[in-house]
């Protein structure tokens, strides 16, 4: 069958019909519906929303919609024993306590079940001691403290500002430095944009606002008690002492009003440079401890949260493919929120809902996609990507054989300036071609394409006339599909102007103030940016599921492989003497990249010329494209990170949110000058070059003519 035999809509109008059916007004209504009460993972409210989405997706016309449940480790504050931080005097009296909750936003004063700010998976504890300010608690911040300033964090409570890196990395770094507790706070320098009012008068973070979030270091494991396997009814669970990624010291988040009270008394060393100063009205002294008059005062944490095995629910919808039902294109985003989820995740979930509705409308008119489309509403993303990871673990054999692509659909907006895309290089051309066909929603770009406004506002640093597309990192539900299973993945959302807004994420991220009104009043009153994101995400899914030849260009992988090889080589060349001493050569890697480039070029030529009416040859060529991403997977995984198996990309070991290229080599080279056994360290560099070169060569060979 040709791909369009099962439809009564002519091929050239398929995509247009799908896109035309997407409506901003519907996205707005869905967002309102999803944000009126909290939908915390593991709660009854989130289970009810799962059932509502299941029912509506069925009404929209999907072939089947099922709930997939798992029993995973979650974390909650103790309702009768709240978490807080104190300043105590020499007699142990509490002379200052941090707030127990965020002041609720207007109109939400009577909403129940708003979880107070907490750091999910913090252990219980009541440590007390002197405070040390550690800036963002990045690897380089601790290097500065320990190596340059000779400040010892052992036995101290550290206070770190949110931003720059994933909070779990901050906690890991503090643990390694010997801290006995961590206080996380939102500094106005990072979460208060100049000239903008605080919520509810603007989109800035008020002083009582606090960012919630998990502090795990799972490295892709999913449920901490069942790494590698689904947390199903017959699962064998590890004991809590053997659980993956749990922090070992108490952690708690606070807002900047409370942070001002803790930091204004700080003594000890002055900040090393201006990059350690935020925007509080304090000197940003590093400590340890308080200044003269207050030197006998200490900080005490009171953390009573509990970890509990709790049931979570994914919603999985299926739209069966007409021609290749055993090839899956997946659109997934999470449903669980910390509180109302006005942006994270419901701005994404509302877009997925409208995409499902549009596909359902086409299906009701007799159309089917060529390939099967799976839609997912993931649970417990906020607790460590648990819903998506458990489902992928349960279905890994199917996914690794049938998975064509995964498109992520968390928050649709983190600003309203321009498009932001992170994806596999295989999707670059798909994204370029699609955005050239879509209208830009941006002011000043009326009648222009999305590609044009995106390229103007966010130009590629390497290629003129092209937009920036970033590497995939982690911190979202694509992780298991891309980093573990090697399924081509991508994500798209509207973002801020990174040039002028240096704050991290958006100011109200994971706070109680992330409401429907935040979006409707300040970010996207007309929902035109949401609609554009729906068109991009939906358009990518449509093309991936419906194009006769998969819209992957392997030549773009060749280009980035060369770029990444050059980059890692230049990092290594900062140590020319050691490279000579230990006979470190990148020749094998550059040779493999050269071979990949040549073979990819030849494959692309064959792709233009082959007989697309021959279903066997078509399937063969498509399988080579589908399995190319899979070919970059090393079954043994990266050192100490067995679930990060992609050799070309992994989440940075220093920031889960960021992607690192040739991560095995990068980590082997990192801080190599400080290693106690240089011979062993450079031996590991050589081993990682070998693994990378072999993998690139092996991947290239999957694109060679089959016989």
């Amino acid at each position: 069958k040709s791909s369009n035999e099962a439809t009564n809509i002519t091929p050239k109008h398929n995509m247009k019909a799908f896109l035309d059916e997407l409506k901003a007004e519907n996205i707005k209504k869905f967002l309102y519906n999803f944000t009126q009460i909290p939908h915390l993972a593991g709660t009854e409210q989130n289970f009810q929303l799962a059932k509502q989405i299941q029912s509506q997706w069925k009404e929209f016309g999907l072939d089947s919609v099922e709930l997939a449940h798992y029993d995973v480790l979650l974390s909650y504050p103790n309702k009768t024993h709240p978490n807080y931080i104190s300043i105590i005097n020499e007699d142990g009296n509490e002379i200052f306590n941090t707030s127990l909750f965020e002041p609720p936003p207007p109109g939400y004063e009577n909403v129940s079940d708003i979880v107070p700010p907490f750091s999910a998976f913090s252990p219980q504890g009541m440590p007390e001691g002197d405070l040390v300010y550690v800036n963002y608690a990045r690897t380089e911040d601790f290097f500065k403290l320990e190596r340059d300033m000779k400040i010892n964090c052992s036995g101290k409570i550290v206070i770190a500002r949110y931003g720059k890196v994933f909070r779990g990395n901050k906690v890991k770094n503090a643990q390694l430095a010997g801290a006995k507790g961590v206080i996380l706070y939102s500094d106005p320098a990072d979460y208060f944009a100049p000239g903008v009012k605080s919520y509810p008068d603007g989109w800035n973070l008020p002083g009582g606002g606090v960012q919630r979030g998990n502090i795990l270091n799972l490295n892709g494991a999913g449920d901490p008690l069942t790494p590698g396997y689904p947390a199903n009814e017959y699962a064998y669970r590890r004991g809590i002492a053997e659980a993956v990624g749990l922090p070992s010291i108490p952690v708690h988040p606070i807002g900047y009003y409370d942070a001002q009270k803790l930091l204004e008394k700080m003594g000890g060393s002055a900040p090393p440079d201006s990059s350690w100063r935020g925007s509080l009205k304090v000197p940003y002294n590093v400590g340890p401890g308080f200044t003269g008059n207050f030197s006998t005062q200490k900080v005490k944490m009171h953390i009573h949260s509990t970890n509990e095995v709790t049931r979570i629910y994914n919603v999985i919808g299926t739209l069966r493919g007409a021609v290749e039902p055993d090839r899956y294109v997946i659109l997934g985003g999470h449903r669980d929120s910390w509180v109302f989820g006005g942006i994270d995740p419901q701005s994404g979930a509302a877009v997925v809902h409208e995409i499902v509705r549009s596909f359902g409308t086409l299906k009701k008119e007799g159309w089917r996609p060529r390939r099967t489309i799976l839609f997912a509403s993931w649970d417990a993303e906020e607790f460590g990507l648990l819903g998506s990871t458990e489902w992928a673990e349960e279905n890994s054999r199917l996914l690794q054989e049938r998975g064509v692509a995964y498109i992520n659909a968390d928050s649709s907006i983190e600003g309203n300036y321009t498009l932001r895309v992170d994806c596999t290089p295989l999707m670059y051309s798909l994204v370029h071609n699609l955005t050239k066909e879509l209208k830009s929603p941006d002011e000043g770009f009326e009648g222009k394409s999305l590609y044009e406004s995106w390229t103007k506002k966010s130009p590629s640093p390497e290629f003129s006339g092209m937009p920036r597309i970033s590497k995939l990192g982690s911190g979202n539900d694509f992780e298991v599909f891309f980093q573990r299973l090697g399924i081509a993945s991508g994500r798209a959302r509207y973002t801020k102007n990174w040039e002028t807004n240096k704050f991290s994420g958006y100011p109200l991220y994971h706070s109680v103030y992330e409401t429907y009104e935040l979006v409707e009043k300040f970010y996207d009153p007309m929902f035109k940016y949401h609609l554009t994101v729906a068109q991009v995400r939906g358009g990518m899914v449509f093309e991936l599921a419906n194009s006769i030849v998969l819209p992957f260009d392997c030549r773009d992988y060749a280009v980035v492989l060369r770029k990444y090889a050059d980059k890692i080589y230049s990092i290594s060349m900062k140590h020319p003497q050691e490279m000579k001493t230990y006979s470190v050569s990148f020749d094998s890697l550059f040779s493999a990249v050269k071979n990949f480039t040549e073979i990819a070029s030849k494959f692309s030529e064959r792709l233009q010329d082959f007989d697309k009416s021959n279903p066997i040859v078509l399937r063969m060529m498509n399988d080579q494209l589908m399995f190319l991403e899979r070919a970059f997977i090393d079954p043994l995984g990266l050192p100490d990170r067995p679930f990060y198996r992609h050799v070309i990309y992994a989440p940075s070991s220093h920031n889960k949110y960021a992607g690192e290229s040739f991560p095995g080599i990068y980590d082997a080279l990192f801080d190599i000058e400080s290693k106690v056994d240089p011979s062993k360290a450079w031996g590991e560099v050589k081993r990682q070059i070998y693994v990378a070169a072999f993998t690139v060569q092996a991947a290239a060979e999957t694109l060679s003519e089959v016989a």
């Epitope: 000239g195 002083g207 900047y256 100063r277 925007s279 509080l280």
Partner: antibody
């Protein structure tokens, strides 16, 4: 349009009292801290007093502490400055000013000012 | 209290000139410095806040810089309407929100 209109200034003898008023319009009065700034003839600007949006917190310059009282009536969108025990050195144009809210914490620079009202303390 | 020292106290310049006014704080005030313009018989007008952020509606020829204790207001090309007195103000240690002594910009 934001407007601040001061009234209540005039000539008063040393040791006397005056009450300045500032009628605000064009913005949500309760959302903003407010303050008074004065300028003696031919001199620079001097901050006098500030009050939080709710009226719960008040602050004064050392030169007026114990003599001046700042207050606000949020139902009337009006700011007040009660000035007692006036001295010759209190002679100045008194400006009512809205706190911009640009600083995330504490008081901020003032983005809107009234036209000022002259207070003359003289025998 | 934090003292604010402005210099010069007055200056003469011509239309089109680049004018620089400095303000020094007696202790570090991070970036919590604003600049005002005041014309005779009028209320002050906010030009710049947080050291370098231009208030809405203020011409782009005005710019501010600095952090810690030393700050600068620059008028890149002086216009006839710019002849006025300029004040700096700190809001780091507030209260009191102390002002500098002012700089009078006169026609040469």
């Amino acid at each position: 349009e934001v407007q601040l209109l001061e009234s209540g200034g005039g000539l008063v003898q040393p040791g006397g009292s005056l009450r300045l008023s500032c009628a605000a319009s064009g913005f949500t009065f309760t959302s903003y801290a407010m303050g008074w700034v004065r300028q003696a003839p031919g001199k620079g600007l001097e901050w006098v007093s500030s009050i939080s949006g709710s009226g719960g917190s008040t602050y004064y310059a050392d030169s007026v502490k114990g003599r001046f009282t700042i207050s606000r009536d949020n139902s009337k969108n009006t700011l007040y400055l009660q000035m007692n025990s006036l001295r010759a050195e209190d002679t100045a144009v008194y400006y009512c000013a809205r706190d911009s809210g640009y600083d995330p914490i504490g008081f901020s620079p003032s983005d809107y000012w009234g036209q000022g009202t002259l207070v003359t303390v003289s025998s | 209290d934090i003292q604010m020292t402005q210099s010069p106290s007055s200056l003469s310049a011509s239309v089109g000139d680049r004018v620089t006014i400095t303000c020094r704080a007696s202790q570090s005030i991070n970036r919590y410095l604003s600049w005002y313009q005041q014309k005779p018989g009028k209320a002050p007008k906010l030009l710049i806040y947080a050291s370098s952020n231009l208030e809405s509606g203020v011409p782009s020829r005005f710019s501010g810089s600095g952090s810690g204790t030393d700050f600068t207001l620059t008028i890149s090309s002086l216009q006839p309407e710019d002849f006025a007195t300029y004040y700096c103000q700190q809001s780091y240690s507030s209260p009191p929100l102390t002002f500098g002594g002012g700089t009078k910009v006169e026609i040469k």
